[in-house]
Interface confidence: medium
């Protein structure tokens, strides 16, 4: 089941251009920006997604684009360089010819540079944490009931396995869940962590990245869970090279 | 008490369609994963699909090739499973089936049962 | 498309006695197998999950086994109650799968 064949959409991806020109007059998707085929049954990368999200009309975005200097997460919005399978190449670079190194992710791993700037290996971000604060409520959650729910929505909304959400911590109102996967336990077919914290993020921002879906409505034993802050933490594999100058 | 209840079978014609209910009672079918499960006669069990009403996801076997589609009213309690292009291979008896509420898929809680005959 | 397969398709047992259901996934599907019990006319039910975890309401004469690829259903002290069809079914995945059962043991008490 690549892509609904009804009426030839993707039902993972808004952000494809979709058409029955696959095999046997099979519904086949291409994501916008990069005209790769994606297939629907699963999540698109997070590479191909910011390319598709850079290509858009501009009036399409709602979010200004921070400036360069700015210290809050920019979104990870800019035009990433993606490898035939969709994830990002090792190394990243502007127009004005500025180059960095990111890590699996598409996140800046290194200082900045030139042309010359080598990235020999694409790092993976084998731990992501994810730090929510939800809207206040009548009382705290319960504890097993919000870890149940939570891997529930990873497994169903983004099929990302069990295995991969390591735990899901609770202190009110702050909810961190811990997403691990290894280059090892990742096995074909695997939805990658960092893929299911995109389309999670965007999700809990309002903006969600599946087709005709209405927006996430998360509940905890039919109390909704309103989300008011996120922060997204990655750990790599290989620690980020940075010089002491970004650190004082 | 939390229960299952399949209808909608019969007897169809070859290339016909039919539509199966599944009405769930006593729990929110919302949050739980429910599978179609098929049984022709004499033979063993054989999964059709899946959906997470919640999330509206739905999963099918590699053989289904479109041909059958799985739904839900939620407000209804109720999920469907449209069979069409219907051959003399898909007379069986159709279960729904509803997953543990936990992180895997095993399945604790089945309806009886709707017996679906294709014959001309 | 992980693949299960089970031994031996029928086995007949006394009454009293102790039989042994074999299942085996073409791939390692860790501890995620769940046996059922089926009876002519009647829908399956679930016997045990996780491999081994017996479900509610569950005669402790079953017991589960295994992880990865090989798995057991053993039933001892065998009652003429017992005489059903068994299927495991593995719980791990949903996705590109064909069928995530088994095909099924019968077991025939004398």
């Known amino acids: 089941h690549t892509a609904a064949q009804d009426n030839c959409t993707c039902p993972t991806n808004k952000m494809t251009v979709c058409s029955p020109d696959g095999p046997g007059g099979r519904c086949q998707c291409r994501a916008l920006g990069s005209g790769m085929a994606v297939d629907c049954s699963t999540l698109t990368s997070k590479c191909l997604l910011l390319k598709a999200r850079m290509s858009a009309p501009k009036n399409a975005r709602t979010l200004v684009r921070p400036s360069e200097h700015a210290l809050v997460d920019n979104d990870g919005l800019y035009d990433p360089d993606c490898d035939p399978e969709g994830r990002f190449k090792a190394r990243q670079c502007n127009q004005t010819s500025v180059c960095w190194c990111v890590n699996s992710v598409g996140v800046r791993r290194t200082d900045k540079g030139d042309l010359s700037l080598r990235c020999d290996e694409l790092v993976r971000t084998h731990h992501i944490l994810i730090d929510l604060r939800h809207r206040p409520t009548a009382g705290a959650f319960n504890h097993s009931d919000l870890d149940a729910e939570l891997r529930r929505l990873f497994r169903e909304r983004y099929r990302l396995h069990p295995k991969f959400v390591a735990a899901v911590h609770y202190e009110q109102p702050t909810i961190q869940i811990e997403l691990r996967q290894n280059t090892s336990q990742k096995a074909a077919g695997d939805v990658d962590i960092g893929d299911a914290a995109y389309y999670f993020e965007r999700d809990i921002k309002g903006e969600s990245l599946f087709q005709g879906r209405g927006g996430l409505d998360l509940r905890v034993r039919g109390e909704p869970l309103q989300v008011e802050r996120t922060l997204i933490y990655y750990l790599d594999e290989i620690p980020p090279k940075f010089s002491m100058k970004r650190l004082t | 008490q939390e229960q299952l209840k399949e209808s909608g079978g019969g007897l169809v014609q070859p290339g016909g369609s039919l539509t199966l209910s599944c009405k769930a009672s006593?729990?929110?079918?919302?949050?739980?994963?429910v599978s179609w499960v098929r049984q022709a006669p004499g033979k063993g069990l054989e999964w059709i699909g899946y959906i997470y009403p919640a999330y509206h996801n739905t999963y099918y076997a590699t053989w289904v090739n479109g041909r059958f589609t799985i739904s839900s009213h939620n407000a209804q309690n109720t999920l469907y499973l449209q069979l069409n292009t219907l051959t003399a291979a898909d007379t069986a008896t159709y279960f729904c089936?509803?997953?543990?509420?936990?992180?895997?898929?095993?399945?604790?809680?089945w309806g009886p049962g709707t017996l679906v005959t294709v014959s001309s | 498309d992980v693949v299960m397969t089970q031994t031996p398709a029928s086995v007949e047992v006394a009454v009293g006695g102790t039989v042994t259901i074999k299942c085996q996934a073409s791939?390692?599907?860790?501890?995620?197998l769940a046996w059922y019990q089926q009876k002519p006319g009647q829908p399956p039910r679930l016997l045990i999950y996780?491999?081994?975890k017996l479900a509610s309401g569950v005669s402790s004469r079953f017991s589960g086994g295994g992880y990865g690829t090989d798995f057991t259903l053993t039933i001892s002290g065998v009652e003429c109650a017992d005489a059903a069809t068994y299927y495991c079914h593995q719980a791990l995945t949903i996705g590109n799968v064909d069928n995530p059962f088994g095909g099924g043991g019968e077991v025939v008490v004398k």
């Open positions: 006593g729990f929110d079918f919302n949050y739980y994963g």
């Open positions: 791939e390692d599907i860790e501890s995620y």
């Open positions: 996780e491999a081994s």
């Open positions: 089936a509803r997953d543990a509420g936990s992180t895997d898929y095993n399945l604790n809680l």
